[in-house]
């Protein structure tokens, strides 16, 4: 049943004498495995024998025996899927029909494959895109309907017989659908490639020539132009004539229109290959080119720079920068249209020629106020001298100059006076708009440049003003020389260096920080009583009674100033000690008796010690000694001792009498 056999393979295979052929092939025998395979050359069916006649190129039987002469032809298939064949080498007389006779247990089939073997290697085929345009990348394809594993080949590209630099990509196909070798070359043709011959050359593995295919490139491109000018350097003077000619060196397809452009703009009514310019003017200077178009697009020639020479035009001056700040640098630029460029310049400041200035630029590194004014220039070239233009104004700005602070008051100034000062200056550009004063204070400015200080302070030593436009210029400070009463008067202990103990020699100093005028007098007082008129107050042997509040006064011709009251503290050991008794020096037994150690001491007593009539120390440390309950045996004389950081003091004896209670008397 023929429907059970399905084959896939190329319909025709191509090769040449001495090469090889590889036949990719698949099949499906649905009733079982292949049992017998015969490869016929040009098989013919014999009706008498019901068998095929023809040359048997390959035969494989059930026992697997293969005749020894069949080494050239190989069956590379299997019993159920693969029917691939190889003939190596292949001969011219192998051309024709190959018949694959397949037999399974119950079925038979003859499959036919065409084989075309040429005497010599057949040429590959070059495929080009329908249109090639300059600078547009195209792919050139070279195709050969041959590929065989046992016979390697290569395809090489040549341009005008020279190998092409571009890398080609070669691919092969050996499948049941197709057998071929293909080379693809990506290439960006230029207009110069038009008409050139491209070759695809088939070579064997050693690079030996086998065959080739050639094509002529048809590269579409815009017109390629050359421009010629008379005179050749394109330099003329006003009134001369100029001729420009446009020549087409290549165009594919043919050109259709011609035009001329100046500085990129089309010239009207100029549509021939020659451009005639008569009696040129300087305005006709510029860049000229011709433009020729075809179906691909317009082509342009190189530009010709036409220079029409003329004498300098009236000049203008550009200043970098005005207004200029004094001390900065300024550059003047003389601008004058001329061809050729001016070779010499003459500069003028306020109409007067500036000696030694012949350049296009004048640079002044450090501008001074006298540099202000009008600057003009004249330019000169080989064709003549230009006219002097209107010129440019340089404004030189500078801070106010010679600023001074002036005191308007009569001298001397006393603390508390109202002082008026003015701020004067010599010149300024721009005008002075404001004033500043140092130091800052809550002061009045009744008018511009005038300062009024109400109630002037003793410490207002100097005042400086600044006159300001865009900048401030400060005057030298002016001394107010304010007179005032002595300041910061205070009492200072000179000796002893440490605390004052009773009996010490003591010196107190009356200090003050400043006085203007400097001549002063001193006064010492305690509790409103005058003690002395020297800067020092001395005690040969201080006593606690000297303690108290002391003040000193310092006066000058302006006034007098008192110190803060200064407390003189005298340290002394406890004195005037006595023992007081509460509720009294006679107490009934069983009650409470409190003994208090009273004293006068500076610093206060820090430690008390109590003693009885036998000078026995009692274990109490407080100012008060409490006996509770008091006993008759506690009757006797007690005394205390007080201690501070200076020393010790002791009290006289105080007698405590403890009498019997009525209960005790009753019991007796």
């Amino acid at each position: 049943d023929s429907s059970k056999w399905v084959f896939e393979h190329p319909e025709t295979l191509y090769a040449w004498e001495g090469a090889c052929v590889w036949i990719p092939c698949t099949y499906r025998a649905l009733d079982g495995d292949l049992e017998s395979f015969i490869l016929f050359h040009n098989p013919e069916y014999n009706k008498n024998t019901s068998k095929f006649d023809g040359t048997r190129l390959y035969e494989s039987t059930k026992d697997g025996k293969v005749p020894s002469e069949q080494k050239r032809v190989q069956f590379l298939g299997d019993k159920n899927k693969n029917c691939t064949l190889s003939i190596h080498p292949v001969h011219l007389n192998d051309s024709g029909q190959l018949g694959l006779r397949m037999e399974s247990k119950t079925e038979k089939w003859m499959e036919r494959i065409h084989l075309n073997v040429s005497e010599r290697p057949f040429p590959p085929h070059i495929q080009l895109p329908p249109e090639i345009q300059e600078s547009q990348e195209v792919t050139l394809t070279c195709l050969l309907n041959f590929s065989c594993y046992g016979y390697p080949i290569q395809l090489q590209w040549l341009l005008e017989g020279v190998p092409m630099r571009q890398a080609a990509v070669t691919s092969t196909s050996l499948t049941i659908k197709s057998v071929f070798t293909r080379s693809e070359l990506k290439f960006s043709p230029q207009w110069s490639h038009h008409g050139k011959i491209v070759t695809c050359q088939l070579q064997d593995a050693d690079g030996k020539f086998l065959s080739n295919d050639t094509v002529q490139l048809n590269v579409k491109h815009t017109p390629k132009l050359e421009i010629k000018v008379t005179p050749s350097d394109a330099i003329v003077r006003e009134g001369d004539s100029v001729t420009m000619t446009c020549e087409v060196s290549s165009s594919n397809p043919e050109y259709t229109t011609v035009s001329w452009l100046k500085d990129g703009t089309s010239l009207k009514k100029q549509n021939t290959f020659t451009l005639n310019l008569r009696e040129v003017t300087k305005d006709q200077s510029g860049k000229y080119c011709c433009q020729v178009s075809n179906d691909v697009g317009p082509g342009r020639s190189e530009e010709v720079f036409l220079q029409v020479q003329y004498a300098p035009e009236p000049s203008t001056v550009q200043i970098l920068h005005s207004p200029a700040v004094e001390g900065s640098q300024v550059e003047f630029l003389c601008m004058s249209l001329a061809n050729p460029l001016p070779t010499n310049y003459t500069w003028y400041h306020n109409g007067k020629e500036m000696q030694g200035r012949t350049e296009e630029k004048v640079h002044i590194p450090k501008i001074l106020p006298w540099h202000a004014g009008t600057y003009s220039c004249v330019a000169e070239n080989i064709l003549g001298t230009g006219q002097r233009g209107p010129g440019a104004e340089l404004d030189v700005q500078y801070p106010p100059k010679k600023v001074t602070t002036v005191i308007q008051n009569p001298m001397p100034i006393r603390e508390g006076d109202t002082v008026t000062l003015s701020c004067n200056y010599n010149s300024s550009n721009p005008s002075v708009t404001r004033y500043e004063w140092k130091p800052h204070g809550a002061w009045e400015e009744p008018s511009l440049g005038v300062l009024k200080i109400q109630n002037v302070g003793w410490d207002n030593t100097t005042i400086a003003c600044a006159a300001c436009n865009s900048w401030c210029s400060w005057a030298s400070p002016v001394a107010l020389n304010v007179q005032y009463a002595p300041r910061d008067v205070r009492v200072r202990k000179i000796k002893p260096l440490s605390e004052i103990h009773s009996g010490n020699s003591v010196s107190l100093q009356c200090d003050f920080s400043s006085s203007h005028p400097k001549e002063v007098q001193f006064f010492w007082e305690k509790n409103g009583r005058l003690l002395g008129k020297e800067s020092q107050l001395n005690f040969d042997s201080i006593s606690p009674e000297d303690a108290g509040s002391y003040s000193c006064w310092v006066n000058n011709s302006i006034g007098q100033t008192a110190s803060k009251a200064w407390t003189l503290e005298v340290l002394y050991a406890p004195r005037r000690l006595r023992v007081s008794m509460s509720p009294g020096d006679q107490v009934m037994e069983g009650k409470s008796a409190t003994l208090t150690c009273e004293s006068d001491a500076n610093p206060p007593v820090s430690h008390y010690t109590w003693f009885d009539w036998n000078n026995q120390s009692l274990p109490y440390h407080s100012q008060k000694l409490r006996l509770e309950p008091v006993k008759v045996q506690h009757s006797g004389a007690y005394w205390c001792q007080g201690t501070n950081s200076v020393g010790k003091g002791r009290s006289p004896l105080s007698t405590l009498t403890v009498y019997y209670s009525p209960e005790t008397i009753g019991r007796r």
Epitope: D612, N614, P619, Q633, G636
Partner: antibody, heavy 119, light 111 residues
């Protein structure tokens, strides 16, 4: 070396009197440079100074304000000891009672072994 | 008379230093230089460690030191050792009728 040996009952009924004795060795109760003190310690009140007795030209006593109305501290020169009596006791008086010696300074260098008294 | 205020507990690792504070008033700690410190191990009587603010009785390690500033006294134990773990009490003479006042006590733990 001064040593203090305490004696007295460990259990006292409420409202009765707590009595403890502290026997002195290595010093005299009549020393005119020492004082003899009772201190107690309980979890609720910590260490608490109760009072002291001492001899200078005569005998003196000082008592803490908290127990002044109930306390008596007496020296016994014949036995070289001193005693504590605390009247009208309550469970609040439950504590460890210590006798201690104060020397010439205000500190306690010598202590008895302590007696736990439970009311 | 209120007890002097001490921290309830202070702890330190062996070799470290710790300080215990004792705060009173001008009537006790601040008014007199009669501050003493006592160490008490469980079940034992207190032991004098420092007297008159900063003096050490013979037999007490020089790792123990005392000081006073204003109404606050301090005990410092340097080079802490395991045997230093105990309760510590301060005490001061006072101008009230109750002549002596003790601190609330501080438990020292050696970690």
């Amino acid at each position: 070396e001064v040593q203090l040996q305490q004696s007295g009952p460990g259990l006292v009924k409420p409202s009765l009197t707590l009595s403890l004795t502290c026997a002195i060795s290595g010093d005299s109760v009549s020393s005119n440079s020492a004082t003899w003190t009772w201190i107690r310690q309980s979890p609720s009140r910590g260490l608490e100074w109760l009072g002291r007795t001492y001899y200078r030209s005569t005998w003196y006593n000082d008592y803490a304000v908290s127990v002044k109305s109930r306390i008596t501290i007496n020296p016994d020169t014949s036995k070289n000891q001193f005693s504590l009596q605390l009247n009208s006791v309550t469970p609040e008086d439950t504590a460890v009672y210590y006798c201690a010696r104060e020397g010439s300074g205000s500190y306690y260098a010598y202590w008895g072994q302590g007696t736990l008294v439970t009311v | 008379q209120s007890a002097l205020t001490q921290p309830a507990s202070v702890s330190g690792s062996p070799g470290q230093s710790i300080t215990i504070s004792c705060t009173g008033t001008s009537s006790d700690v601040g008014g007199y230089n009669y501050v003493s410190w006592y160490q008490q191990h469980p079940g034992k009587a207190p032991k004098l460690m420092i007297y008159d603010v900063s003096n050490r009785p013979s037999g007490v390690s020089n790792r123990f030191s005392g000081s006073k500033s204003g109404n606050t006294a301090s005990l410092t134990i340097s080079g802490l050792q395991a045997e230093d773990e105990a309760d510590y009490y301060c005490s001061s003479y006072t101008s009230s009728s109750t002549l002596y006042v003790f601190g609330t006590g501080t438990k020292v733990t050696v970690l």
